[in-house]
């Protein structure tokens, strides 16, 4: 029950997080005109990953897309890439996690398969969240650098008279949305990974005890270990991680009707 709750909660938290990452990526307010200690202008500038906007005092807003690809700063391209990778990984993770949910039955899918899918989606969510946090942080760092550069260059001209007042930009709402969304996706991913451990078949720490008969030998082992019919010295005690998949050195091991999994 706790496993189902953890998995379900992880899914919901990740879903909210990914929705937030998508929203942040689409938002125009990644950077907004700094109004503190600046002359009051009749226009307000703000910029996103895809376009920049100018809002007039009248309320009229004009946005222009960045129609060039090569002319854009490399950092902006990197941020775009990180956010898109985050969205794609998150979307795939959501798709995988839907099928991995314990409360949803699909055919005769074993718990071990669901555990694997849960782990996969969890890892995807973690990477997705990290991509978003990295993207937003890179952009924030770029803003901070530019802010102090423009502050240093703010007052130029003869005899201290203000000739040019540079527009300085500060953190926009999208950055905070991105950080929170990335964090939620990360938390959701961790929860999925935790749920995966509970979904995996039960394991014990008891040592396996093998009984060797003179001829055909059958090894009986407690739960969590795979019983194998051994021939000569090829009898092995193997711990199951993959829900029944055999490793290469088990090629000569044949299951019998006495196997306990």
């Amino acid at each position: 029950m706790a496993v189902t709750a953890c998995q379900g909660l992880g899914f919901v938290v990740s879903l909210i997080g990914i929705a937030g990452i998508i929203a942040a990526t689409c938002m125009d307010q990644w950077s907004t005109q700094d109004l503190y200690n600046n002359p009051v202008t009749a226009v307000f500038n703000y910029q996103g990953l895809w376009r920049s906007c100018v809002r007039e005092s009248s309320g009229f807003t004009e946005c222009r897309g960045y129609f060039t690809l090569l002319g854009l700063p490399a950092m902006l391209q990197a941020v775009r890439a990180l956010m898109i990778v985050g969205i794609v990984l998150g979307a795939i993770g959501l798709l995988v996690s839907i099928f991995a949910l314990k409360c949803i039955r699909i055919g005769s899918m074993e718990d071990s398969a669901k555990a694997n899918m849960t782990l996969t989606s969890g890892i995807m969510f973690i990477v997705s969240g990290l991509c978003a946090i990295a993207g937003v942080s890179v952009f924030a760092n770029m803003l901070v650098t530019n802010f102090w550069m423009s502050t240093a260059n703010m007052y130029t001209g003869m005899g201290g008279m203000v000739q040019t007042v540079q527009t300085r930009y500060t953190f926009g709402a999208a950055l905070f949305v991105g950080w929170v969304a990335g964090g939620l996706t990360l938390i959701g991913g961790v929860m999925m990974c935790i749920a995966c451990r509970g979904l995996a078949p039960e394991e014990t720490n008891y040592k396996a005890v093998s009984y060797h008969a003179s001829g055909h030998s059958v090894a009986y082992k407690p739960g969590g270990f795979k019983a194998s019919t051994g021939f000569g010295s090829n009898t092995k005690n193997k711990k199951i991680y993959d829900g029944g998949a055999r490793t290469e050195d088990e090629v000569q091991s044949y299951p019998s009707k006495h196997d306990y999994v």
Epitope: Q33, A42, N45, E56, S57
Partner: antibody, heavy 117, light 113 residues
Framework: QVQLKESGPGLVAPSQSLSITCTVS????????VSWIRQPPGKGLEWLGV???????YYNSALKSRLSISKDNSKSQVFLKMNSLRTDDTAMYYC???????????WGQGSTLTVSS | DTVMTQSPSSLTVTAGEKVTMSCKSS????????????LTWYQQKPGQPPKLLIY???TRESGVPDRFTGSGSGRDFTLTISSVQVEDLAIYYC?????????FGAGTKVELK
């Protein structure tokens, strides 16, 4: 068609208060801003202030302490109030509509104010 | 406040002549967000309210004859009348439309010789 008409007292004694009303038609005060500009006799234009559709107002910094702009959207009226009038406040007072891009695209004919004892 | 300086204060011209007047701002009126210059030109004829001519430094208002041309960027702006007509005799004002408080220049008076 867009129209703006100013109506004021005409003559006011020094130290008294002034109230001029700008009645508009052909557009909504919730959508557009209205600015006030004055022009002393034989002199240039002086921007007094503006009130935007959302109700936020900006003023000429030299007159801010004695100036107030308000509006009544339902009556399509904008009000300019100025206190502690001096003789150098004698001027033609215009109200003008701000276009979406903020320039003054329509002007009233103006209201003459004389500050004299 | 942003100071707008217009020159010359008056011009005496003959009909058909090319007229150029200047407007200088104490601060740049160029907005980096959209690369537009927030400078507006108005024409005021005697006994009339001002009339909008040009906004964004170079965009003509609809109905304004194409003999009126606005140019310039940052702090220096120019209004040119390619072939002045009798009806163009008026006072021309430039306005800072970027920084609050919005400010007007003192005007350039165009008179007939």
């Amino acid at each position: 068609q867009v129209q703006l008409k100013e109506s004021g007292p005409g003559l006011v004694a020094p130290s008294q208060s002034l109230s001029i009303t700008c009645t508009v038609s052909g557009f909504s005060l919730t959508d557009y801003g209205v600015s006030w500009i004055r022009q002393p006799p034989g002199k240039g234009l002086e921007w007094l202030g503006v009130i935007w559709g959302g109700g936020n107002a900006y003023y000429n910094s030299a007159l801010k302490s004695r100036l107030s702009i308000s509006k009544d959207n339902s009556k399509s009226q904008v009000f300019l109030k100025m206190n502690s009038l001096r003789t150098d406040d004698t001027a033609m007072y215009y109200c003008a509509k701000n276009g979406l891009l903020r320039y003054l695209d329509y002007w009233g004919q103006g209201s003459t104010l004389t500050v004299s004892s | 406040d942003t100071v707008m300086t217009q020159s010359p204060s008056s011009l005496t011209v003959t009909a058909g002549e090319k007229v150029t007047m200047s407007c200088k701002s104490s601060q740049s009126l160029l907005n980096s967000g959209n690369q537009k210059n927030y400078l507006t030109w108005y024409q005021q004829k005697p006994g009339q309210p001002p009339k909008l001519l040009i906004y964004w430094a170079s965009t003509r208002e609809s109905g304004v004859p194409d003999r009126f041309t606005g140019s310039g960027s940052g702090r220096d702006f120019t209004l040119t009348i390619s072939s002045v007509q009798v009806e163009d005799l008026a006072i021309y004002y430039c306005q800072n439309d970027y920084y609050y408080p919005l400010t007007f220049g003192a005007g350039t008076k165009v008179e007939l010789k």
